[in-house]
Interface confidence: low
C-alpha cells in the first residue's frame, strides 16, 4: 500500500522532521504550514486547525517561507542622493543604492544606509585610486612631468605635452605652452595661433564627464568637523 | 468604492465624541484611512492616519485629542473632550500607502458643532 | 516639520486666462505633491499626485511640476468651472506632523 500523504496538521513519527515548507510548533505539538513569500501568520496551528496567513500588511515583506506573527518593515523611501533600485513589495525590501558621483560610506545588509560625495581631486592632483560603489576616490599629488588643471573625481595627472620650445614650463595644474617657430599650416586672417606639440598626448587621458548637479544633501549620520582630504576639494 | 461618515452632532464642550468612517467596496487590511477637518471658512487640516495593520499616526497638535480606531468595514475617530476649536466638517479618505501619498476617495464629510 | 507654504492666499483670473499657484515644503518631500481642488460645501477632489500626474477624468489644462521642496499647480484657459480653494498636499510623512495640506488658494474667475 502506498504510503499515506499526511495533511497538515499533523504529528510526525518519532524522530522524523517536518517536511519541506512546514514548520514544528511547540505548543500544538504538530506540523504546521509555513506562509508563503508576502505573508506571515494571523492565527498559528493547533491539533486541529492549520495556520492561517494573512498577506502583509503596506510598507511590510516577507521574503521567504516564514511563521512569523508580523511582516518585516520595508526601509524607509531612499533619500534624494539614493536610487531605489528595489521597490518595496510584499515580498521584498525596499533597496537604495547611491547615485551616480555618490559612493556608499555606511552600508547594510542590502544596499546602503548612507550616501557620499564623491571627493574631487583638485587642479594639481589626480585620482590615484577611482571611486566605487563603497570607497571614496583617492587623491594623488601630479608627480613632475604630469598635470591636472581639473577639479574632478575622475580624472588622472596627465604627461606635459613636449614641446620643441617651451613658452611657458608646466607644473603639476597647468600644461606646458610651446612656443610655435614655424606654423605648419596657413591660418585664415584672424584666426588664433595654436601651439602646435610635437607629439600629442599620450593615451593616458580620459574624457571629463560633465559636472553633476548634485543638491547638496546633509547627513543622516552625525559627522564630525574633520579637514579635507589632501588634495580634495572642501565643498 | 464609497465612504460615508457619520456621528457629526451638536455636542458640549468637554464631552466625548466619536465619528464613525464606513466603507464600501473597500479592503482595509490594505488601504490606510486619514482623518481630516475643516474648521468653517477655513482650510483643510490633518488629524491622523491609521495602518491597515491598526497601528495609528497622529498630527502633532492631536496626540491625546484624538484616538483613532479601526473594524473591518469601519474607521472611529474618537475626540476625548471637545472645545469650541473643534467645530468643523470632518472628512475620511482612504490613502494607500503603497502609492504616491495622496488620498483619492474622501467621503462627503460630517458637522460637529461644539458650543454650551 | 514638512511645512507647507501655499501662495498666494487668493488669486483672480479672467476667463481664458492662467493661473500659477506654488507650494513649498520646509524639507524635501521629493515628488510626493498632491493637489486638490475643493468648492463650497464639496469634498476635496485630487487634481494631480507624485506632483505632476493627472488624476482620472481631470482635464489637461490642470498642470503641475516641481520636486523637492518646490512646487506649481498651474491651470491654463481658465473656465468659470475652476472658481474653487486648491490646496497642495505631502504625501512624503504622515507622522508626528502639523499638518499635511498647504493653507489654500482661492481662485476667483471674472
Known amino acids: 500500500l502506498p504510503a499515506q500523504v499526511a495533511f497538515t496538521p499533523y504529528a510526525p513519527e518519532p524522530g522524523s522532521t517536518c517536511r519541506l515548507r512546514e514548520y514544528y510548533d511547540q505548543t500544538a505539538q504538530m506540523c504546521c504550514s509555513k506562509c508563503s513569500p508576502g505573508q506571515h501568520a494571523k492565527v498559528f496551528c493547533t491539533k486541529t486547525s492549520d495556520t492561517v496567513c494573512d498577506s502583509c500588511e503596506d510598507s511590510t515583506y516577507t521574503q521567504l517561507w516564514n511563521w512569523v506573527p508580523e511582516c518585516l518593515s520595508c526601509g524607509s523611501r531612499c533619500s534624494s542622493d539614493q536610487v531605489e533600485t528595489q521597490a518595496c513589495t510584499r515580498e521584498q525590501n525596499r533597496i537604495c543604492t547611491c547615485r551616480p558621483g555618490w559612493y556608499c560610506a555606511l552600508s547594510k545588509q542590502e544596499g546602503c544606509r548612507l550616501c557620499a560625495p564623491l571627493r574631487k581631486c583638485r587642479p594639481g592632483f589626480g585620482v590615484a585610486r577611482p571611486g566605487t560603489e563603497t570607497s571614496d576616490v583617492v587623491c594623488k599629488p601630479c608627480a613632475p612631468g604630469t598635470f591636472s588643471n581639473t577639479t574632478s573625481s575622475t580624472d588622472i595627472c596627465r604627461p606635459h605635452q613636449i614641446c620643441n620650445v617651451v613658452a611657458i614650463p608646466g607644473n603639476a595644474s597647468m600644461d606646458a605652452v610651446c612656443t610655435s617657430t614655424s606654423p605648419t599650416r596657413s591660418m585664415a586672417p584672424g584666426a588664433v595661433h595654436l601651439p602646435q606639440p610635437v607629439s600629442t598626448r599620450s593615451q593616458h587621458t580620459q574624457p571629463t564627464p560633465e559636472p553633476s548637479t548634485a543638491p547638496s544633501t546633509s547627513f543622516l549620520l552625525p559627522m564630525g568637523p574633520s579637514p579635507p582630504a589632501e588634495g580634495s576639494t572642501g565643498d | 468604492q464609497s465612504l460615508e461618515e457619520s456621528g457629526g452632532r451638536l455636542v458640549t464642550p468637554g464631552t466625548p465624541l466619536t465619528l464613525t468612517c464606513t466603507v464600501s467596496?473597500?479592503?482595509?487590511?490594505?488601504?490606510?484611512m486619514i482623518w481630516v477637518r475643516q474648521a468653517p471658512g477655513k482650510g483643510l487640516e490633518y488629524i491622523g492616519f491609521?495602518?491597515?495593520?491598526?497601528s495609528a499616526w497622529y498630527a502633532s497638535w492631536a496626540k491625546g485629542r484624538f484616538t483613532i480606531s479601526k473594524t473591518s468595514t469601519t474607521v472611529d475617530r474618537e475626540i476625548t473632550s471637545p472645545t469650541t476649536e473643534d467645530t468643523a466638517t470632518y472628512f475620511c479618505a482612504t490613502y494607500d500607502t503603497y502609492g504616491y501619498g495622496d488620498t483619492r476617495l474622501w467621503g462627503p464629510g460630517t458637522l460637529v458643532t461644539v458650543s454650551s | 516639520a514638512y511645512d507647507m507654504t501655499q501662495t498666494p492666499a487668493s488669486v483672480e483670473v479672467a476667463v481664458g486666462g492662467t493661473v500659477t499657484i506654488k507650494c513649498q515644503a520646509s524639507e524635501s518631500i521629493f515628488s510626493y505633491l498632491a493637489w486638490y481642488q475643493q468648492k463650497p460645501g464639496q469634498r476635496p477632489k485630487l487634481l494631480i499626485y507624485y506632483a505632476s500626474t493627472l488624476a482620472s477624468g481631470v482635464p489637461s489644462r490642470f498642470k503641475g511640476s516641481g520636486s523637492g521642496t518646490q512646487f506649481t499647480l498651474t491651470i491654463s484657459g481658465v473656465e468659470c468651472a475652476d472658481a474653487a480653494t486648491y490646496y497642495c498636499q505631502q504625501g512624503y510623512d504622515f507622522s508626528a506632523v502639523d499638518n499635511v495640506f498647504g493653507g489654500g488658494t482661492e481662485v476667483v474667475v471674472k
Open positions: 467596496g473597500i479592503d482595509l487590511s490594505t488601504y490606510a
Open positions: 491609521i495602518r491597515p495593520g491598526g
